[in-house]
Structure formats: structure tokens, C-alpha cells
């Protein structure tokens, strides 16, 4: 369960891939599209509001006999819109929604090498936001093999 309904902290940051491509958001036909692209030098990076929540895992669920906490995040590039996992389509979409946000809008935060982070779907453990064909997609990751795979690594810049 997510502890409380308020985030423990929030920050505005731009989101880029391991290979320094920018994640951008564009309003098209009354809906937002998400792009992964090389930005021209003078173009300002889009900022995302990251809201961080603590999720309490009782020892009965954690499997190691210890109560644990996870850091979960929601990502909002513009007012009232949040990134959401569409597990059926293996896609990442921007949806307008009201609070309380659906579980599909929450991602477990993982720290990685090279000062990168990864975002794991709360609703589908082992599935991460990743880059596929210059778009964001949901990518299934084999824990034993691929946690360092570059296509699920992202950089946050305040």
C-alpha cells in the first residue's frame, strides 16, 4: 500500500535516455504524444513533475521476513496529465486523470549505474518503461540477465 495520499517529495526534471536523447511531449489532435529524440542545441528540454511516494511492503509480502519500503513515482509533464502504463498494448501513454491516480500511473523507482534510474510498472512487476523505435514502450526484463540494459535506463536532470 502507498503510505498516505501525499507525495513525500516532488521535483521538476527533464528526462533523457542513457544515450542522451530527450523525452518530449507534444499536443496533437487534442491528445499528447511522447517522443524520444535528439534535441537541437538551443531547444529547451521538456520538464516533468516527478512526485515520489513511499510504498510500504509488509513482511508477509516481501518474502524476506522484513517490512520494506519502496519508492514509487508518478510523472506529469503537464497539468492533469500523467504517464500511464498500458499493459495490454505494452505502451506508455499520457492520460488526463483526477486524483487518486490509478495504479497504472505509479512506477517503482530503481537506481542504476551511471547515475541512471529505471521505472518499473507497479501493476506489472518485471516490466519497465523503455525505449523502442524512438518511442516509450513497456519492456519485460529478465531480472537475472538484463537489469543494466540500456533501453530501460533514464537520466533525470533538475
Amino acid at each position: 500500500s502507498i503510505t498516505g495520499i501525499s507525495p513525500i517529495t516532488e521535483s521538476l526534471a527533464s528526462l533523457s535516455t542513457y544515450n542522451d536523447q530527450s523525452i518530449t511531449f507534444a499536443l496533437e489532435d487534442e491528445s499528447y504524444e511522447i517522443y524520444v529524440e535528439d534535441l537541437k542545441k538551443d531547444k529547451k528540454k521538456d520538464k516533468v513533475l516527478l512526485s515520489y511516494y513511499e510504498s510500504q511492503h509488509p513482511s508477509s509480502e516481501s518474502g524476506d521476513g522484513v517490512d520494506g519500503k519502496m519508492l514509487m513515482v508518478t510523472l506529469s509533464p503537464t497539468k492533469d496529465f500523467w504517464l500511464q502504463a498500458n499493459n495490454k498494448e505494452h505502451s506508455v501513454e499520457l492520460h488526463k486523470c483526477e486524483k487518486p491516480l490509478p495504479d497504472q500511473a505509479f512506477f517503482v523507482l530503481h537506481n542504476r549505474s551511471f547515475n541512471c534510474v529505471s521505472f518499473e510498472c507497479k501493476t506489472d512487476p518485471g516490466v519497465f518503461i523503455g525505449v523502442k523505435d524512438n518511442h516509450l514502450a513497456l519492456i519485460k526484463v529478465d531480472y537475472s540477465e538484463n537489469l543494466g540494459s540500456e533501453n530501460i535506463l533514464f537520466k533525470l536532470s533538475e
Epitope: 521535483s11 518499473e120 543494466g148
Partner: antibody, heavy 121, light 107 residues
Framework: QVQLQESGPGLVKPSETLSLTCTVS????????VHWIRQPPGKGLEWIGV???????SYNSALMSRVTISEDISKSQVSLKLSSVTAADTAVYYC???????????????WGQGTLVTVSS | DIQMTQSPSSLSASVGDRVTITCLAS??????LAWYQQKPGKSPKLLIY???RLADGVPSRFSGSGSGTDFTLTISSLQPEDFATYYC?????????FGQGTKVEIK
């Protein structure tokens, strides 16, 4: 109950390799990152590196050419090796566990008691 | 690397005093800052994480504030067991650097 215990030789000769083991219990290395930190006598804390949940490793660039961190999940152990040691590597060495599953953003919630390693001939 | 500068490096205070320690980061670290207490011969103990969150079992007289580059640890009413050295640490980027420490001594 969460526990971390450092072990290894208390005395290492200059130019040799310092080897320490952190044995953990009460939590899973597949969920939590384990860090190595050192503290020279009477001085402050220096972060050495981390073995993250999932097995990726990050090192302090100031030590990267000399340091290796590895794990043996079956024994619930994380190892530290520091090569070509000098007197400047004399310190209390600690291992510590992340506060959060999968993330270091919440700091280090549990620490071992530390082990003093002296580098001297 | 991100440099963390703590001030003061030491202070003398009496039981019941309000004590404030500051930590300055060389670049923004959002709110990814932790405070630790260390007593002689002991391991550091996590007091505050995410700049403002009280760790489990830590008395409410300890509080943290700040974001970006400027952070503060406050002890509202110093108790005899609070005489120790306090360290800040940034967790925004590796290497996860510590401040040089603030020793709180009995006046």
C-alpha cells in the same frame, strides 16, 4: 532482524590487496543495495561503492582503478577488494544497506559495526 | 563530484538548546539528502532521509528542511544523548558524498 557484519584481516601490508566480506541477514540482496563506506581514524566518511539490487555495481571514481565489489547471493555476502593499498587506506570499513528497495535515494538505513583495517608493514 | 559543505564544523551547546546544522551542496540535489548521527566507536545512524523524513525510531526533536542546494538539520531541544558528530550525505548522484561532519559538544 536486519544485520550486516564485516569481516576480514585487520592488518594488510602496503602494496597488497585488502579483502573484506559483508555477511547480511534479515533481508534479500535481490531487493536492497549494499554499500561500502570507509572512515580513516578521526576523519569523515567516504563512500567506496555499491552493489545494487539486480547486480549492477557503481564505484567512487577516486578509487575505481583499485576497487572491486562482488556478491555471493547463495551465502548472502558482498565482498570488497582494494588493491595496491597504502597507509592512506587505513580506516574503519563499513557495509550498509539501502533504506528503500531498489533505490539509494533514501540513504543507508542499516550499518554493520565496522572493521578497522590497518595498512602497515 | 558533488561537494557537500557542512557548517559549523563544531559547536558547543547545553542541554535544552536549539541546535541548527547546515549543509550546502555544490549543485542541486533535489531533496535527496540524508543526515546521520555518529557516536565515538559506533556506526553512523540514519536520522533523516529525503531531506525532511524522520527515520524509524528517531525522536521528533530532530527535523530536516531544505531542497536544491541548502539543507538544515535542527534539534529542537538538545538532550544528553544527542552529543555526537552529525553528517549530511547527498544521494542524488554517485559518488554519494558526505559532508565533513559537525561535532556537537557539551558547553
Amino acid at each position: 532482524q536486519v544485520q550486516l557484519q564485516e569481516s576480514g584481516p585487520g592488518l594488510v601490508k602496503p602494496s597488497e590487496t585488502l579483502s573484506l566480506t559483508c555477511t547480511v541477514s534479515g533481508f534479500s540482496l535481490s531487493k536492497y543495495g549494499v554499500h561500502w563506506i570507509r572512515q580513516p581514524p578521526g576523519k569523515g566518511l567516504e563512500w567506496i561503492g555499491v552493489l545494487r539490487a539486480g547486480g549492477t555495481i557503481s564505484y567512487n571514481s577516486a578509487l575505481m582503478s583499485r576497487v572491486t565489489i562482488s556478491e555471493d547471493i547463495s551465502k548472502s555476502q558482498v565482498s570488497l577488494k582494494l588493491s595496491s593499498v597504502t597507509a592512506a587506506d587505513t580506516a574503519v570499513y563499513y557495509c550498509a544497506r539501502d533504506h528503500y528497495y531498489y533505490s539509494s535515494f533514501g540513504g543507508f538505513a542499516s550499518w554493520g559495526q565496522g572493521t578497522l583495517v590497518t595498512v602497515s608493514s | 563530484d558533488i561537494q557537500m559543505t557542512q557548517s559549523p564544523s563544531s559547536l558547543s551547546a547545553s542541554v535544552g538548546d536549539r541546535v541548527t546544522i547546515t549543509c550546502l551542496a555544490s549543485q542541486t540535489i533535489a531533496t535527496w539528502l540524508a543526515w546521520y548521527q555518529q557516536k565515538p566507536g559506533k556506526s553512523p545512524k540514519l536520522l533523516i532521509y529525503a531531506a525532511t523524513r524522520l527515520a524509524d525510531g528517531v525522536p521528533s526533536r530532530f527535523s530536516g528542511s531544505g531542497s536544491g542546494t541548502d539543507f538544515t538539520l535542527t534539534i529542537s531541544s538538545l538532550q544528553p544523548e544527542d552529543f555526537a558528530t552529525y553528517y549530511c550525505q547527498q544521494l542524488y548522484n554517485t559518488p554519494y558524498t558526505f559532508g565533513q561532519g559537525t561535532k556537537v559538544e557539551i558547553k
